[in-house]
């Protein structure tokens, strides 16, 4: 039992705070924001993690065509409502009263509405589109090496099981990666598309959520895989709920 | 290397209340637990409570509330266990240990005798 | 409160014999198990926790398995100095809760 086992720390999230207080010295993490228990064996919700990032101080053609139903996060950061799981609440409220209903990654899929506004289900987001534009390269990457390296990260880094990436597409300079995972198809256990696509998007901007991990270093075939623009496409399993003059605008 | 001290044995009238210590040396006496168990003669092992002196938040078992208290020094690296209105079960040798992810350094033992 | 039904409550054994305890949770308890070994007069030992870590200076011989809510110690060849208690202990939640021990003698 040596000192380095010694360390109560949450690898899998930097927002929290740890001690060694839990059952027989259980080392137990709580999200900062929240106040909520993590499992550090896993990653932490989005919702959570969201929550935290709120709380901290601030500082400083192969390709697949979005759905129309497709969303993007355009409304960026807020304070999120979270369940006892650490899941988001359907629906979302600012201070000033305005409410709105979100889908299972936390993105505003109804026009936004007063206390009265109802959002009767957590809506799942079943499909993501991660785009990706890498900066300029000597050549193209191989396109079955840059395949196994994202389905390897995805894996390994994120614990993603390999059957949600359901395809990586490359037209150099774009690449794009397709998460699926149905609720039928979700076990126990399993980590959800949209935590680990927030995980990837974190990372790619050199934000990492990782305790003492170095930032992400891709590399396909030792060629640095450098991104240069990310574009998440959000796909629920029930069309959002949008009035015509935001469709048209 | 990590040791707990234990004070020594106890003999006390039925009624009355004893205070026991567990010195630690050896590592940082806040970053860890410090558990209390119980062994009856002939029997088994219990457990007492807990107490991580790095916060001063504690846990009891709920058959020793009003029965056990558990303080901690950190200024003197001691945790102690107050026992109240003894009875001859309370008999029983006393053992402190530092736990840390179920792993535990055990003290050498503090034995409590209630007789009248 | 989570009970821990620990088997046998006694037993001999040979020396060099394979030597199994078990313990048995009345819920899952996600691997949070330790093993104790407690000898007359002396302090309890850690031999494993989390199910199955051996503690850094524990002879080899002694491997912990398990998960949910079944768990054994197993001694794979049995040695003068084994005799004595064995305790399991659960840490999933508060309070803890030992087995009610296995009294290991040599036959």
């Known amino acids: 039992h040596t000192a380095a086992q010694d360390n109560c720390t949450c690898p899998t999230n930097k927002m929290t705070v740890c001690s060694p207080d839990g059952p027989g010295g259980r080392c137990q993490c709580r999200a900062l924001g929240s106040g909520m228990a993590v499992d550090c064996s896993t990653l932490t919700s989005k919702c959570l993690l969201l929550k935290a990032r709120m709380s901290a101080p601030k500082n400083a053609r192969t390709l697949v065509r979005p759905s129309e139903h497709a969303l993007v996060d355009n409304d960026g950061l807020y304070d999120p409502d979270c369940d006892p799981e650490g899941r988001f609440k359907a629906r979302q409220c600012n201070q000033t009263s305005v409410c709105w209903c979100v889908n299972s990654v936390g993105v505003r899929r109804t026009d936004k509405g007063d206390l009265s506004l109802r959002c009767d289900e957590l809506v799942r987001t079943h499909h993501i589109l991660i785009d990706l534009r890498h900066r300029p390269t000597a050549g193209a990457f191989n396109h079955s090496d840059l395949d196994a390296e994202l389905r390897r990260l995805f894996r390994e880094r994120y614990r993603l099981h390999p059957k949600f990436v359901a395809a990586v597409h490359y037209e150099q300079p774009t690449i794009q990666i397709e998460l699926r995972q149905n609720t039928s198809q979700k076990a126990a256990g399993d980590v959800d598309i949209g935590d680990a696509a927030y995980y990837f998007e974190r990372d790619i901007k050199g934000e990492s959520l990782f305790q003492g991990r170095g930032g992400l270093d891709l590399r396909v075939r030792g060629e640095p895989l450098q991104v240069e623009r990310t574009l998440i496409y959000y796909l629920d399993e029930i069309p959002p709920k949008f009035s015509m003059k935001r469709l048209t605008a | 290397q990590v040791q707990l001290q234990q004070s020594g044995p106890e003999v006390v009238k039925p009624g009355a209340s004893v205070k026991m210590s567990c010195k630690a040396s050896g590592y940082r006496f806040t970053d860890y637990v410090i558990n209390w168990v119980k062994q009856r003669s002939g029997q088994g092992l219990e457990w007492i409570g807990q107490?991580?002196?790095?916060?001063?938040?504690?846990h009891y078992n709920k058959n020793f509330k009003g029965k056990a208290t558990l303080t901690a020094d950190k200024s003197s690296n001691t945790a102690y266990m107050q026992l109240n209105s003894l009875t001859s079960e309370d008999s029983a040798v006393y053992f402190c240990?530092?736990?840390?992810?179920?792993?535990?350094?055990w003290g050498q033992g503090t034995l409590v005798t209630v007789s009248a | 409160d989570i009970k821990m039904t620990q088997s046998p409550s006694s037993m001999y054994a040979f020396l060099g014999e394979r030597v199994t305890i078990t313990c048995k949770a009345s819920?899952?308890?996600?691997?949070?198990l330790s093993w104790f070994h407690l000898k007359p007069g002396k302090s309890p030992k850690s031999l494993i926790y989390?199910?199955?870590r051996l503690v850094d200076g524990v002879p080899s011989r002694f491997s912990g398995s398990g998960s949910g809510q079944d768990y054994s110690l197993t001694i794979s060849s049995l040695d003068y100095e084994d005799v004595g208690i064995y305790y399991c202990?659960?840490?999933?939640?508060?309070?803890?809760?030992f087995g009610g021990g296995t009294k290991l003698e040599l036959k």
């Open positions: 202990l659960q840490y999933d939640e508060f309070p803890l809760t």
């Open positions: 240990a530092r736990f840390f992810e179920g792993f535990a350094y």
């Open positions: 819920q899952g308890i996600n691997n949070y």
């Open positions: 107490i991580y002196p790095g916060s001063d938040t504690f």
């Open positions: 989390r199910a199955n």
